[in-house]
């Protein structure tokens, strides 16, 4: 469970991938497309408002019912629209909601290395936004194996302004 | 119920070594990033290295880089400081400490070990 | 890397009385700001972590504030077992850094 509704805290952050390939949101035909490609020199990295929530671990997953919090993430990157998990078509969506958010918009926070994080489905653990075909996909990870698989990793440039002006 | 407890401290010479264990239990070890942070007599605390969960990141203070290895033993549960080199400056109270947050160092350190000292003198 | 100053250094202060020490980083953390309380020959334990969240089994006179640069940790009632070093901490990023630390000892 989310512990509370409120977020701990927001961050207004560009999203890229390990390989340095920038996230960007077009609107197209009154829906939200992502994109994963390469931005011309002089373009301005499209802005992702994070919002970091604490979670209990659900007790299946705690050995001994100890291993308290995990942080989650909801991910918005223009005004009532955020990224969603969907689990059958094992893509990543945005979609326009209100709160409380389902449990699709929410990711576990995995912190990989120095600026590199993973973002885990709440609603299917095991599988993370990837990046496949120059596009945001669900791909299932064997923890024993390909944690650190680079197209699960992306960076996040923290934006130094005022978070709630980013709509 | 959470337990960090070191060992391994004691008294060694300048540019000698010594190894540092932290044995964790009451949580899912491999869940979490481990830390060392130490506090030279009389004085503050400071951050000496962090390893991720996988065991497959770690990172360092500039005042210990290339000298101290820091490492984890998932079978066992314990995670390690290896300290080589050492100097005068290196002697402190060296605690593990637990994070918050699975899989993520956001949070803060809410177990620490009860600490062990080493001394570094001729 | 990211600095952490504190002040005051000390306080001296009497039982009852409301603290408020100070903490900011030299470049912005969001809220990924810890305080510690650490009392003689003991090891750091955790009072506050995200800036405000208060940790398990604190009292609640201690509470936590801020964001970006400026936290504020307030003891609002000093008790006995208050006396000791607070310390704050960045966990925004690598290497983490920890405050010089606010004695807080008896008028």
């Known amino acids: 469970s989310i512990t509370g509704i409120s977020p701990i805290t927001e961050s207004l952050a560009s999203l890229s991938t390990y390989n340095d390939q920038s996230i960007t949101f077009a609107l197209e035909d009154e829906s939200y497309e992502i994109y994963v490609e390469d931005l011309k020199k002089d373009k301005k990295k499209d802005k992702v408002l994070l919002s970091y929530y604490e979670s209990q671990h659900p007790s299946s997953e705690s050995g001994d019912g100890v291993d308290g919090k995990m942080l989650m993430v909801t991910l918005s990157p223009t005004k009532d629209f955020w990224l969603q998990a969907n689990n059958k078509e094992h893509s990543v969506e945005l979609h326009k909601c209100e709160k409380p958010l389902p449990d699709q918009a929410f990711f576990v926070l995995h912190n990989r290395s120095f600026n590199c994080v993973s973002f885990e489905c709440k609603t299917d653990p095991g599988v993370f936004i990837g990046v496949k075909d120059n596009h945001l996909a669900l791909i299932k990870v064997d923890y024993s194996e390909n944690l650190g698989s680079e197209n699960i990793l992306f960076k996040l440039s923290e934006i130094l302004e005022h978070h709630h002006h980013h709509h | 119920e959470v337990q960090l407890v070191e060992s391994g401290g004691g008294l060694v010479q300048p540019g000698g070594s010594l190894r540092l264990s932290c044995a964790a239990s009451?949580?899912?070890?491999?869940?979490?990033?481990m830390t060392w942070v130490r506090q030279a007599p009389g004085k503050g605390l400071e951050w000496v290295s962090t390893?991720?969960?996988?065991?497959?990141?770690?990172y360092y203070a500039d005042s210990v880089q290339g000298r101290f290895t820091i490492s984890r033993g998932h079978s066992k549960n314990t995670l390690y400081l290896q300290m080589n080199s050492l100097r005068a400056e290196d002697t402190a109270v060296y605690y593990c400490?637990?994070?918050?947050?699975?899989?993520?160092?956001?949070?803060?350190?809410?177990?620490w070990g009860q600490g062990t000292m080493v001394t570094v003198s001729s | 890397d990211i600095q952490m100053t504190q002040s005051p250094s000390s306080v001296s202060a009497s039982v009852g009385d409301r603290v408020t020490i100070t903490c900011r980083a030299s470049?912005?953390?969001?809220?990924?700001l810890a305080w510690y309380q650490q009392k003689p020959g003991k090891a750091p334990q955790l009072l506050i972590y995200a800036a405000s969240r208060l940790q398990s089994g604190v009292p609640s006179r201690f509470w936590g504030s801020g964001s970006g640069t400026d936290f504020t940790l307030t003891i609002s009632s000093l008790q006995p077992e208050d006396f000791a070093t607070y310390y704050c901490?960045?966990?925004?990023?690598?290497?983490?850094?920890f405050g010089p630390g606010t004695k807080v000892d008896i008028k």
């Open positions: 400490a637990k994070p918050t947050y699975s899989r993520s160092w956001y949070g803060a350190f809410d177990f």
């Open positions: 470049q912005g953390i969001s809220s990924w």
């Open positions: 009451g949580f899912t070890f491999s869940n979490y990033a």
């Open positions: 390893i991720s969960g996988s065991g497959d990141n770690t």
């Open positions: 901490q960045q966990a925004n990023n690598f290497p983490f850094t």
